[in-house]
Amino acid sequence: MMTGTIETTGNISAKKGGSVILQCHLSSTMAQVTQVNWEQHDHSLLAIRNAELGWHIYPAFKDRVAPGPGLGLTLQSLTMNDTGEYFCTYHTYPDGTYRGRIFLEVLESSVAEHSARFQIP
């Protein structure tokens, strides 16, 4: 039985050209995390954090994605096309997979604020 919960940064906004941290946190489970996958709205993989092998950033995102902090991901040089859903998938033993969702809105406005409140989706 899966007892854990994923907390995410929820719905966030950031300004064009800026950067944003995508963060998920798994709690309330004894399961061991063996891998975390980060996917974009079109299901393309941005990055994988593997317990043994460390981080792998996919080539299409190498210039704009930085690993961390922790198991999170930092998106840089944001464009309007980055607006959309992002998913973290935790592979855990023996629970299985936990999935969290973040919605990022990239704003033209220079007064866009990056909200970083945590919420359970």
Epitope: Q32, T34, E52, D95
Partner: antibody, heavy 122, light 106 residues
């Protein structure tokens, strides 16, 4: 190469305790969960539970709570199984086994120790 | 807990035979199933994981198939070293093993 090496056979009297060790080498010990599996004489494999090698938190399968304790010493990449108040029915081969694979569909016990025979007899 | 039922429990076969072992799960487990071979006095050895993926170094005469609740391990042409006991194993939630299938020489 990657391997798990267990401590040697044990002959114990009922009521005694035993501690079996499982030393890992050739890989990062804390990256993979560790399991314990029991095989009674002439019987099949029975999953006893597992220990999170990151946190040290153990999880015990039904029937293996109370007298069974899983622990770790990550400084020497070793997992331990301790059984207290031994009974004749604890006579078995005990295996440690690593959960290999990174994504859930890859999980399997890919590396096993050679097994430790524990005999409980008066 | 999820129960795994293997059949048959015993199987007599000859070198060169095609051998099939079945494993049924009490509820759906997707493809979260592994197969192991165990010889007397030895630790189990991983043959197949993810229901059908051959572990590195395992001969190609071994194959696995199935998903959900029904799985099979097939040995296409039994070799002398294949006489052993085979176990299926569901690998997530609370892992469990099947009861084993002993493959003996006919």
């Amino acid at each position: 190469q990657m391997q798990l090496v267990q401590s040697g056979s044990e002959l114990k009297k009922p009521g005694a305790s035993v501690k079996v060790s499982c030393k890992a080498s050739g890989y990062t010990f804390t990256s993979y969960p560790m399991n314990w599996v029991r095989q009674a004489p002439g019987q099949g494999l029975e999953w006893m539970g597992w220990i999170n090698t990151n946190t040290g938190n153990p999880t015990y399968a039904q029937g293996f709570t109370g007298r069974f304790v899983f622990s770790l010493d990550t400084s020497v990449s070793t997992a331990y199984l301790q059984i207290s108040s031994l009974k004749a029915e604890d006579t078995a081969v005990y295996y440690c086994a690593r959960t290999g694979g990174y994504s859930v569909d890859e999980y399997s016990f890919d590396i096993w120790g050679q097994g430790t025979t524990v005999t409980v007899s008066s | 807990d999820i129960q795994l039922t293997q059949s048959p429990s015993f199987l007599s076969a000859s070198v060169g035979d095609r051998v099939t072992i079945t494993c049924r799960a009490s509820q759906g487990i997707s493809s979260y199933l592994a197969w192991y071979q165990q010889k007397p006095g030895k630790a189990p050895k991983l043959l197949i994981y993810a229901a059908s993926t051959l572990q590195s170094g395992v001969p190609s005469r071994f194959s696995g198939s199935g998903s959900g609740t029904e799985f099979t391990l097939t040995i296409s042409s039994l070799q002398p070293e294949d006489f052993a006991t085979y176990y299926c194993h569901q690998t997530i939630f609370r892992p469990t093993f099947g009861g084993g299938t002993k493959v003996e020489i006919k």
